[in-house]
C-alpha cells in the first residue's frame, strides 16, 4: 500500500499499471482516444483514479512536457468559480476562456483552457501506484 497518502501525495510504491506512466509519486494515464468531459471522468473513476487534479505550478510544468498542442481534459470545472474535482480552488494558474458555455477545464503544452464540456478531447487520469486510497 501507499503509506500516509493524502489528496496530493503518494509515498514510494510499486510501479504503475500497463499504459500508465509513473512520474514522481503518481501514475498518469494519457488517453489515445477522445471523450467528452463526463465520459472521461467516468473512465478514470472506473480505474480507481480521477481526472487529473494538478496541485501546483511545478506539477503542471512537469506534465506539460508530455503534452502537445492538443488539449486534454482534466479534473477542473467552473461551478461559480474554477474548482478542481477535489474541491480546491484553481489558484496557481490562469485559465483562458471566451464563453459562458466553457465550464470544463483542459490542458495542453501552453497552459489551461476552458472548453464546453461536450467536446471530445483526450484526457489525463491520475492515481497513486496500485493499491492506494487517494484519488488525487
Amino acid at each position: 500500500l501507499c503509506q500516509g497518502s493524502n489528496y496530493s501525495t503518494c509515498a514510494s510504491c510499486p510501479s504503475c499499471p500497463d499504459r500508465w506512466m509513473k512520474y514522481g509519486n503518481h501514475c498518469y494515464y494519457f488517453s489515445v482516444e477522445e471523450k467528452d468531459w463526463n465520459s472521461s471522468l467516468e473512465f478514470c473513476l472506473a480505474r480507481d483514479s480521477h481526472l487529473l487534479v494538478i496541485t501546483d505550478n511545478q506539477e503542471m510544468s512537469l506534465l506539460q512536457v508530455f503534452l502537445s498542442e492538443a488539449f486534454c481534459w482534466i479534473g477542473l470545472r467552473n461551478n461559480s468559480g474554477w474548482r478542481w474535482e477535489d474541491g480546491s480552488p484553481l489558484n496557481f494558474s490562469r485559465i483562458s476562456s471566451n464563453s459562458f458555455v466553457q465550464t470544463c477545464g483542459a490542458i495542453n503544452k501552453n497552459g489551461l483552457q476552458a472548453s464546453s464540456c461536450e467536446v471530445p478531447l483526450h484526457w489525463v487520469c491520475k492515481k497513486c501506484p496500485f493499491a492506494d486510497q487517494a484519488l488525487f
Epitope: F71, N98, F100, V101, Q102, S115, C117, E118, V119
Partner: antibody
Framework: DVKLVESGGGLVKLGGSLKLSCAAS????????MSWVRQTPEKRLEWVAT????????YYPDTVKGRFTISRDSAKNTLYLQMSSLNSEDTAVYFC???????????????WGQGTSVTVSS | DIQMTQSPSSLSASLGERVSLTCRAS??????LNWLQQEPDGTIKRLIY???SLDSGVPKRFSGSRSGSDYSLTISSLESEDFVYYYC?????????FGAGTKLELK
C-alpha cells in the same frame, strides 16, 4: 442559406403557458448550439436560453430558470421553448438564433430568425 | 451580472460621416463581444463577433475595436441603410447581456 422561422407566439393569460418553435434550415442543425433571445416593447434585448448541439446542456438566466425549458429535435431540425407561469414581463418578441461552439472558441448568435410575438395579458 | 453600458442612446449623423458607438463592460469580458444591427422591420443581423471580426457579407466600412473595457463599433462612411438600431452583446459570462441600443438617425 441559413433560415430560422419562429412560430407559436400569441396572446396568453397571466400564469399561462405557451410553446414556441423555431424551424431551422440551410445548415446542419445538429452541429450548432441554439438560443432564444427576446425583445421587450421598450426594445431591450434579453437572453432567454441556450442549448448545446446534443441537447444535453442547457443554460438559462435566473429570470426564466424553472419556468422556461429549451429543447430541440434534431430529426425535425426544430428548436423549442416551453414557457410556463408567464407574467407581464415576459411580453416580448421572441427570436431564435444560432450559435457555434468549437470547444475553446464560441461564436454567439450569428444568425437570427424574424421573431414571434408573445403578449401576456391579465 | 455584467452590465453593458452603450452610448450614445441615439446619434444624428450625415451621409458619408464617420461615427463610433461604444459599449463599456462592467467586468472583464476578454473580447467576447458582438455588434448587432436591427432593421426597422425587426430583422437582426450580426455585424462583428469577438470584438473585431467582420461577419461575411458585412461591408468593410464597419469595424470593431477594443480599448480596455471599452468596445467600439465604427462606421467609416455612413450610407443610407446604416440608419438603424445597433446593439452590443457580451457572451463571456452568464447571463448574456446586451447594451441598451443606439438609434442612428439621419441628420
Amino acid at each position: 442559406d441559413v433560415k430560422l422561422v419562429e412560430s407559436g407566439g400569441g396572446l396568453v393569460k397571466l400564469g399561462g403557458s405557451l410553446k414556441l418553435s423555431c424551424a431551422a434550415s440551410g445548415f446542419t442543425f445538429s452541429s450548432y448550439y441554439m438560443s432564444w433571445v427576446r425583445q421587450t416593447p421598450e426594445k431591450r434585448l434579453e437572453w432567454v436560453a441556450t442549448i448545446s448541439n446534443s441537447g444535453r446542456s442547457t443554460y438559462y438566466p435566473d429570470t426564466v430558470k424553472g419556468r422556461f425549458t429549451i429543447s430541440r429535435d434534431s430529426a425535425k431540425n426544430t428548436l423549442y421553448l416551453q414557457m410556463s407561469s408567464l407574467n407581464s414581463e415576459d411580453t416580448a418578441v421572441y427570436f431564435c438564433a444560432r450559435d457555434r461552439d468549437y470547444g475553446y472558441t464560441y461564436e454567439a448568435l450569428d444568425y437570427w430568425g424574424q421573431g414571434t410575438s408573445v403578449t401576456v395579458s391579465s | 451580472d455584467i452590465q453593458m453600458t452603450q452610448s450614445p442612446s441615439s446619434l444624428s449623423a450625415s451621409l458619408g460621416e464617420r461615427v463610433s458607438l461604444t459599449c463599456r463592460a462592467s467586468q472583464d469580458i476578454g473580447g467576447s463581444l458582438n455588434w448587432l444591427q436591427q432593421e426597422p422591420d425587426g430583422t437582426i443581423k450580426r455585424l462583428i463577433y469577438a470584438t473585431s471580426s467582420l461577419d461575411s457579407g458585412v461591408p468593410k466600412r464597419f469595424s470593431g475595436s477594443r480599448s480596455g473595457s471599452d468596445y467600439s463599433l465604427t462606421i467609416s462612411s455612413l450610407e443610407s441603410e446604416d440608419f438603424v438600431y445597433y446593439y452590443c452583446l457580451q457572451y463571456a459570462s452568464s447571463p448574456l447581456t446586451f447594451g441598451a441600443g443606439t438609434k442612428l438617425e439621419l441628420k
